[in-house]
């Protein structure tokens, strides 16, 4: 399938549209402090050049690498070694070097201004003065605050954010049409991008077995009717689509995924009987509605497991002719029957399973040797259903923001050493846990609350990553992707913390807060309460209950006052007092 | 200045309810922290329950969760005590508790207090 030109083949397979919008998404993730107009620039003159080898694939330049062609377009930007330092270095590399250090130096915390939405009537005209450029715009400011952002959903995303704007600037009341819209977009997006920061990091981590072994659980849960050969081509094609977008090469990427919707939706008879309307959809939406799609009904009558992974005399024959086609006939197995785990949990008991056979097929008596594997089983699933019962019966009882707060003095106790921001995103995230999947019967909570959980605690550990402080957070995220929210139940207090020194300028709020979204008031809360952690970590959590309430209490009142500020000024320092006097700081 | 008044303690079997009143005095009564604390003969005052001035918070001692109720009436300038399932542990003088910071009365600091009421709870 080799192509004289590959940016021409590109271009002919995904149209100037998607190119150009996949180019610019791509340039913005690498580059993430570039200016808008400089990264259009840059779009604009290879989208010029992708042209001129579709007219001529034999032209000068058109047989690169799309990794060449768009590293040496990136290396023309004159300010590169002022705004992004080191990374500059990388265009003294060759490929396929550049293009991993360019990698490398993508920030998954870039020191961007927080976007204020403008009111609506603005929005509404630059959209109308210029579309194009208001939605390139979009792509530009979303990839570079989220740079593995899944490009062709980014694409999806766009094209509602189009189409939500072209519907409410027609609306009586614009605002009342657009606002939820674009919330919804904003949430979603944000869920998306964390989603997929998980795949790259179990890609750039833990390396590709791993993330096809994540695939093989969560696509048999979801086709269980499909043959073991169909789940595993599947996990082939998709591993090599995000292998592709998880390592910038977007174009090939996105090509790919269309191909792979294609692929599924010619073999849906095969596959799954919930695909017919995905199918039916236009190339964005289906590709998004075939990765969202609920879960198949299971056969019915499936067989035992015991037969063949436990009774049969054969099983360490099978495992030694090809270890991890058995592992993943095994997994296949087991998430097929069991939609109501989560996947972290089947790859836990096939990893088990997996430790079991190595042992003991080295063992005298094989058979003897594993044959009760299956009851290793039953403590790893019974940890987190019983982790979930407690924790959506405390969410239930606390309510979403103090749910979140019980988590943010948890977790500022397990790791206190982790930046105050960091921690109040995490737990916050965390918190939604409940909202999101309590509500489900049990059948469903587990997958949803813990495969969640696994991506929130990711975040932790990419912006741990960054700038590490805690060996305790290095531990948990390097040790194993599927025990990594384990790891952090398991830790307890850090006993080693030296309490940080007291600054009543961290305690010290004025009259802006009072003008503050809830949401934005939440946040001012629970970064106190994290740093009273941070003070006072031996707290008990009515102690801290007590001066949450007194917070709440003072925040209330000066807000009501006539002199806001004098009233924030002078109770503010009682109420410093006073939580100084009863937590003994 | 805020004066305190308990009332409603006795002599009740183990299992029964009582329901203590704590009558305020002052006009900004909403602007205090309410609490509950006992003693016991031979043993330190401690923390039974308290509610935010606004009553929209609460908080309870483990030994009492569950059982105890705290509540308050900001229009009738009380604050009360439900207690259901009482036993003998439970016998105590309880004293109410004001304080414009819920952490101080939490910590046992509260600047003003009742004289106590007596609750006796027989097997």
């Known amino acids: 399938d080799a192509h004289k030109s590959e940016v021409a083949h590109r271009f002919k397979d995904l149209g100037e549209e998607n190119f150009k919008a996949l180019v610019l998404i791509a340039f913005a993730q690498y580059l993430q402090q570039c200016p808008f107009e400089d990264h259009v620039k840059l779009v604009n003159e290879v989208t010029e050049f992708a042209k001129t080898c579709v007219a001529d694939e034999s032209a000068e330049n058109c047989d690169k690498s799309l990794h060449t062609l768009f590293g040496d377009k990136l290396c023309t930007v004159a300010t590169l070694r002022e705004t992004y330092g080191e990374m500059a270095d990388c265009c003294a590399k060759q490929e396929p070097e550049r293009n991993e250090c360019f990698l490398q130096h993508k920030d998954d915390n870039p020191n961007l201004p927080r976007l204020v939405r403008p009111e609506v009537d603005v929005m509404c005209t630059a959209f109308h003065d210029n579309e194009e450029t208001f939605l390139k715009k979009y792509l530009y400011e979303i990839a570079r605050r989220h740079p593995y952002f899944y490009a062709p959903e980014l694409l999806f995303f766009a094209k509602r954010y189009k189409a939500a704007f072209t519907e409410c600037c027609q609306a009586a009341d614009k605002a009342a049409c657009l606002l939820p819209k674009l919330d919804e977009l904003r949430d979603e997006g944000k869920a998306s991008s964390a989603k997929q920061r998980l795949k790259c990091a179990s890609l750039q981590k833990f390396g590709e077995r791993a993330f096809k072994a994540w695939a093989v659980a969560r696509l048999s849960q979801r086709f269980p009717k499909a043959e073991f050969a169909e789940v595993s081509k599947l996990v082939t094609d998709l591993t090599k689509v995000h292998t592709e977008c998880c390592h910038g090469d977007l174009l090939e990427c996105a090509d790919d995924r269309a191909d792979l919707a294609k692929y599924i939706c010619e073999n849906q008879d095969s596959i799954s009987s919930k695909l017919k309307e995905c199918c039916e959809k236009p190339l964005l939406e289906k590709s998004h509605c075939i990765a969202e799609v609920e879960n198949d009904e299971m056969p019915a009558d499936l067989p035992s497991l015991a037969a063949d992974f436990v009774e049969s005399k054969d099983v360490c024959k099978n495992y030694a002719e090809a270890k991890d086609v058995f592992l993943g006939m095994f997994l296949y197995e087991y998430a097929r029957r069991h939609p109501d785990y989560s996947v972290v949990l089947l790859l836990r008991l096939a990893k088990t399973y997996e430790t079991t056979l190595e042992k003991c097929c080295a063992a005298a008596d094989p058979h003897e040797c594993y044959a009760k594997v299956f009851d290793e089983f039953k403590p790893l699933v019974e940890e987190p259903q019983n982790l979930i019962k407690q924790n959506c019966e405390l969410f239930e009882q606390l309510g979403e923001y103090k749910f979140q707060n019980a988590l943010l003095v948890r977790y500022t106790k397990k790791v206190p050493q982790v930046s105050t921001p960091t921690l109040v995103e995490v737990s916050r995230n965390l918190g939604k846990v409940g909202s999101k999947c309590c509500k489900h019967p049990e059948a469903k909570r587990m997958p949803c609350a813990e495969d969640y959980l696994s991506v929130v605690l990711n975040q932790l550990c990419v912006l741990h990553e960054k700038t590490p402080v805690s060996d305790r957070v290095t531990k948990c995220c390097t040790e194993s992707l599927v025990n990594r929210r384990p790891c952090f139940s398991a830790l307890e207090v850090d006993e080693t913390y030296v309490p940080k020194e007291f600054n009543a300028e961290t305690f010290t709020f004025h009259a802006d807060i009072c003008t503050l979204s809830e949401k934005e008031r939440q946040i001012k809360k629970q970064t106190a309460l994290v740093e009273l952690v941070k003070h006072k970590p031996k707290a008990t959590k009515e102690q801290l209950k007590a001066v949450m309430d007194d917070f709440a209490a003072f925040v209330e009142k000066c807000c009501k006052a006539d002199d806001k500020e004098t009233c924030f000024a002078e109770e503010g320092k009682k109420l410093v007092a006073a939580s100084q006097a009863a937590l003994g700081l | 200045e805020v004066q305190l008044v308990e009332s409603g303690g006795g002599l009740v079997q183990a299992g029964d309810s009582l329901r203590l009143s704590c009558a305020a005095s002052?006009?900004?009564?909403?602007?205090?922290?309410m609490g509950w604390f006992r003693q016991a003969p031979g043993t330190e005052r401690q923390f039974v329950a308290r509610?935010?001035?606004?009553?929209?918070?609460?908080d309870y001692a483990d030994s009492v969760r569950g059982r105890f109720t705290i509540s308050r009436d900001n229009a009738k300038n009380t604050v009360y005590l439900q207690m259901n399932s009482l036993k003998p542990e439970d016998t105590a003088v309880y004293y109410c508790?004001?304080?414009?910071?819920?952490?101080?009365?939490?910590?046992?600091?509260?600047?003003?207090w009742g004289q106590g009421t007596q609750v006796t709870v027989s097997s």
């Open positions: 509610i935010t001035g606004k009553g929209d918070s609460t």
């Open positions: 508790a004001a304080d414009a910071f819920n952490s101080l009365l939490q910590a046992g600091r509260a600047e003003y």
């Open positions: 002052g006009r900004t009564f909403s602007s205090y922290a």
